[in-house]
């Protein structure tokens, strides 16, 4: 008996071939001997089966001696043995219909779990193997679960159902809702305008929800809500914003915040949360601000940084085009009695300059100028 695997919702074509290459009388029946369809002269005839409106044939093949049974919009319960009667012969085809669906929604928040459930006909014992977009393989029976979804799990999951040495492939598109970056860091000189961007790693037709940016300044004992906002169909509207600092927010996606001035008291870490409508849980992105200040007070030239810097970062003071006078893995460096000229304060990571501030030291009889 020939075995054919089908997918729920798809169309299957069961073949039936006669030795004579011409249109002759044929009938398709199910295992209960109920007629599904056949031919009568020029007409296609249909029997009283449950398949009535979903059963079809391809008349262009009849004169070649082929009499297919086409079943549209397959259902699990269409799984059965189908019998083609032609030229006093009987051809049997066993059809097994499978369905594979995601637990709830195919749009899931980062960190959530994905469960895939296999629908199969009674008496079948299929095995399932799924391959994620990043190439991870998972195997299972009726259900497959993946916990802690990551951004790289977004995309098409390809699942293969195996039964009777035959296989059928399902493709399920999964969207992991997350920000493009889990964390970002902005380096700014004191007084400069700061731009924070929070691009999303997904696109959806309508995006509605609400969000908030909490800020923990390095100098503050507790965190504070800097801004709250609403998102409606990708349009952003500010609900509440602190007076100090007075953040500005873009009206369109990607989420964009502007801090008019980088000041030492703002240096620190923020956490932007976004709660999406009809989703449990929130999206998070961490943002860090590092602020640099170079000053000269009397005979002391100082360079300081505030904010979350890694211990391997190097802070240096050097006279332009000369070797660094001082270089330390600390948040403040200084030079006493600096000679006149353009001094550079540099924050670097393995030789790569992250932040630079210049200060002009004038001969001792005049006051310093900060460009």
């Amino acid at each position: 008996k020939k075995v054919v695997l089908g997918k729920k919702g798809d169309t299957v074509e069961l073949t039936c071939t006669a030795s004579q290459k011409k249109s002759i009388q044929f009938h398709w029946k199910n295992s209960n001997q109920i007629k599904i369809l056949g031919n009568q002269g020029s007409f296609l005839t249909k029997g009283p089966s449950k398949l009535n409106d979903r059963a079809d044939s391809r008349r262009s093949l009849w004169d070649q001696g082929n009499f297919p049974l086409i079943i549209k919009n397959l259902k699990i319960e269409d799984s059965d043995t189908y019998i083609c009667e032609v030229e006093d012969q009987k051809e049997e085809v066993q059809l097994l219909v499978f369905g594979l669906t995601a637990n709830s929604d195919t749009h899931l928040l980062q960190g959530q779990s994905l469960t895939l459930t296999l629908e199969s006909p009674p008496g079948s014992s299929p095995s399932v193997q799924c391959r994620s977009p990043r190439g991870k393989n998972i195997q299972g029976g009726k259900t497959l679960s993946v916990s802690q979804l990551e951004l790289q799990d977004s995309g098409t999951w390809t699942c293969t159902v195996l039964q009777n040495q035959k296989k059928v492939e399902f493709k399920i598109d999964i969207v992991v809702l997350a920000f493009q970056k889990a964390s970002s860091i902005v380096y700014k000189k004191e007084g400069e305008q700061v731009e924070f961007s929070f691009p999303l790693a997904f696109t959806v037709e309508k995006l509605t929800g609400s969000g908030e940016l909490w800020w923990q300044a390095e100098r503050a004992s507790s965190s504070k809500s800097w801004i709250t906002f609403d998102l409606k169909n990708k349009e952003v509207s500010v609900k509440r914003v602190t007076q100090d600092p007075k953040l500005q927010m873009g009206k369109k996606l990607p989420l964009h915040l502007t801090l008019p001035q980088a000041l030492p008291q703002y240096a620190g870490s923020g956490n932007l949360t976004l709660a999406l409508e009809a989703k449990t849980g929130k999206l998070h992105q961490e943002v860090n601000l590092v602020v640099m200040r170079a000053t000269q007070l009397q005979k002391n030239l100082t360079c300081e940084v505030w904010g979350p810097t890694s211990p391997k970062l190097m802070l240096s003071l050097k006279l332009e085009n000369k070797e660094a006078k001082v270089s330390k893995r600390e948040k403040a460096v200084w030079v006493l009695n600096p000679e006149a000229g353009m001094w550079q304060c540099l924050l670097s990571d393995s030789g790569q300059v992250l932040l630079e501030s210049n200060i002009k030291v004038l001969p001792t009889w005049s006051t310093p100028v900060q460009p």
């Epitope: 009568q40 002269g41 020029s42 007409f43 296609l44 005839t45 249909k46 079809d56």
Partner: nanobody, 116 residues
Framework: EVQLVESGGGLVQPGGSLRLSCAAS????????MSWHREPPGRGREWLAD????????DYLASVRGRFTISRDNARNTLYLQMDSLRSEDTGVYYC?????????WGQGTQVTVSS
């Protein structure tokens, strides 16, 4: 009363085109799959093309595939057959019919003659 009335036949030169129409009445046209058949002179009736009730799926006899196009307008209760690159062997009486029996409806036919 069920009626299928074909029109649009006539005399045409080889390589020419014709568009046949079939006006349906007396039944719910939009629920039935339909077909075109022809009867060449001195030969039996042969099936040419099928179209499902929605117009999404079509099927053609190999010798007319690529030259003939079956279509339908359910709002106007009308079935069409666009015939291009006509040949002398396309001469015959053209019939529209329901694809299935029951109900087994046939039209009266329209004559198509392809000759120079």
């Amino acid at each position: 009363e069920v009626q299928l009335v074909e029109s649009g036949g006539g005399l045409v030169q080889p390589g020419g085109s014709l568009r046949l129409s079939c006006a349906a009445s007396g039944f719910t046209f939009s629920r039935l799959a339909m077909s075109w058949h022809r009867e060449p002179p001195g030969r039996g009736r042969e099936w040419l093309a099928d179209i499902d009730s929605s117009g999404d799926t079509t099927d053609y006899l190999a010798s007319v595939r690529g030259r003939f196009t079956i279509s339908r307008d359910n709002a106007r209760n009308t079935l069409y057959l666009q015939m291009d690159s006509l040949r002398s062997e396309d001469t015959g009486v053209y019939y529209c019919a329901s694809r299935e029996d029951p109900p087994g409806y046939w039209g009266q036919g329209t004559q198509v003659t392809v000759s120079s």
